[in-house]
Interface confidence: low
């Protein structure tokens, strides 16, 4: 199974080769290269020297080879860099190339969503409900769930909205939001609203949004 590697958007991923080099072979007799799941070449060290004529343009200038750890660093990570990578080592002999080592890695690229933000889109209507939107931006992968917590002195109610998501065509990052019409329980106490974004790994909480309720007006007399 491939080694699983996680790294963050716009940062650097380390793609290891994990070559024990038990024969103590010099780089000057080896051809070391990394390729992606499409077999496009990221980096090639040919007999000790970095060689660029087979490197695909999308990786050009984005890699650096650490000869001490036999690791390739892929910089300025994009979401589209996620996937499988192979480090392959050939021993160059007069008779030709002999593959002596292969290492497979699976790269996941993550981007942290921003702290969810609650924005009211209507005033409180006769102390009955409020329309609000909660949004979080520039994350990857898409989150599992987005919800709103309405907390009073005596109770906590969770509202699950339909999560709207959009994905940037270039960066592939997600922006997500939910819009809710939150109705208030029959209480006179103040309440606090939180927005929660759940991903596979984290639970992000918005800053509290506080609502101070006025005393409810008595209902008009009921006339049959």
């Amino acid at each position: 199974a491939p080694l699983k590697i996680q790294a963050y958007f716009n940062e650097t991923a380390d793609l290891p080769c994990q070559f024990a080099n038990s024969q103590n072979q010099s780089l000057s007799e080896l051809v070391v290269f990394w390729q992606d799941q499409e077999n496009l070449v990221l980096n090639e060290v040919y007999l000790g020297k970095e060689k660029f004529d087979s490197v695909h343009s999308k990786y050009m200038g984005r890699t650096s080879f650490d000869s001490d750890s036999w690791t390739l660093r892929l910089h300025n990570l994009q979401i589209k860099d996620k996937g499988l990578y192979q480090c392959i080592i050939h021993h160059k002999k007069p008779t030709g190339m002999i593959r002596i080592h292969q290492m497979n890695s699976e790269l996941s690229v993550l981007a942290n969503f921003s702290q969810p933000e609650i924005v009211p889109i209507s005033n409180i209507t006769e102390n009955v409900y409020i329309n609000l939107t909660c949004s979080s931006i520039h994350g990857y992968p898409e989150p599992k769930k987005m919800s709103v917590l309405l907390r009073t002195k005596n109770s906590t109610i969770e509202y699950d909205g339909v999560m709207q998501k959009s994905q940037d065509n270039v960066t592939e990052l997600y922006d997500v939001s939910i819009s809710l019409s939150v109705s208030f329980p029959d209480v006179t106490s103040n309440m606090t609203i939180f927005c929660i974004l759940e991903t596979d790994k984290t639970r992000l909480l918005s800053s509290p949004f506080s609502i101070e309720l006025e005393d409810p007006q008595p209902p008009p007399d009921h006339i049959p």
Epitope: Q37, E38, V41, E44, H56, K58, Q86, H90
Partner: antibody
Framework: EVQLQQSGPELVKPGTSVKMSCKAS????????IHWVKEKPGQGLEWIGY????????KYNEKFKGRATLTSDKSSSTAYMELSSLTSEDSAVYYC???????????????WGQGTLVTVSA | DIVMSQSHKFMSTSVGDRVSIACKAS??????VVWFQQKPGQSPKLLIY???YRYTGVPDRFTGSGSGTDFTFTISSVQAEDLAVYYC?????????FGGGTKLEIK
């Protein structure tokens, strides 16, 4: 010598499916991506997608997604393409193609099969 | 998708002439362009890779040039056996796309 031997011509009815094969020889099958390309008379060449037989990763042209299915069989060094819901627009020659050697330059469509002619007709 | 445009569907030339075929990409594809030759009833054959490099065994009368969006394929002295359709293709990004092809006819 690298060779890609494709299956013979197919005459199929609209609405059905067709599965064609591409048998590779002369190299390590799992080391190279296999692409599939459509040639429609007078309309040139169109990339359908690829499969990397090493880990069966596939990528499709959105235009063919859902209708083309690429698979491979390591034991027989054979790549397959199945096309479903066929119409007369699918009447064409279909080629498989292999990329070149990564350590001597990486050119995606270096070796080609002889093509499989598919005719869709009622 | 990146569109590869070959301005001429047909070109007529004589043996010994020099002929150039143009190919334009709808966006920058660096030098990730290849040229294929397809003779009647045959599979395409790779001639030029990375815009300007001749593939192994390809005669030196075939050359390629260009980068970014504008590319040219040239046959310096056309031979009778060069009768074929010539395609440019980008593999800068998927979906890989081909030009519409230019059919070279020998007078």
């Amino acid at each position: 010598e690298v060779q890609l031997q494709q299956s013979g011509p197919e005459l199929v009815k609209p609405g059905t499916s067709v599965k064609m094969s591409c048998k590779a020889s002369g190299y390590t099958f799992t080391s190279y991506v296999i692409h599939w390309v459509k040639e429609k008379p007078g309309q040139g060449l169109e990339w359908i997608g690829y499969i990397n037989p090493y880990h069966d990763v596939t990528k499709y042209n959105e235009k063919f997604k859902g209708r083309a299915t690429l698979t491979s069989d390591k034991s027989s060094s054979t790549a397959y393409m199945e096309l479903s819901s066929l119409t007369s627009e699918d009447s064409a020659v279909y080629y498989c193609s292999r990329q070149g050697d990564p350590y001597s330059g990486n050119y995606q469509f270096t070796y080609w099969g002889q093509g499989t002619l598919v005719t869709v007709s009622a | 998708d990146i569109v590869m445009s070959q301005s001429h569907k047909f070109m007529s030339t004589s043996v010994g002439d020099r002929v150039s075929i143009a190919c334009k990409a709808s966006q920058d594809v660096s030098t990730e362009v290849v040229w294929f030759q397809q003779k009647p009833g045959q599979s395409p054959k790779l001639l030029i890779y990375s815009a300007s490099y001749r593939y192994t065994g390809v005669p030196d009368r075939f050359t390629g040039s260009g980068s970014g969006t504008d590319f040219t394929f040239t046959i310096s002295s056309v031979q009778a056996e060069d009768l074929a359709v010539y395609y440019c293709q980008q593999h800068y990004s998927t979906p890989y796309t081909f030009g519409g092809g230019t059919k070279l006819e020998i007078k």
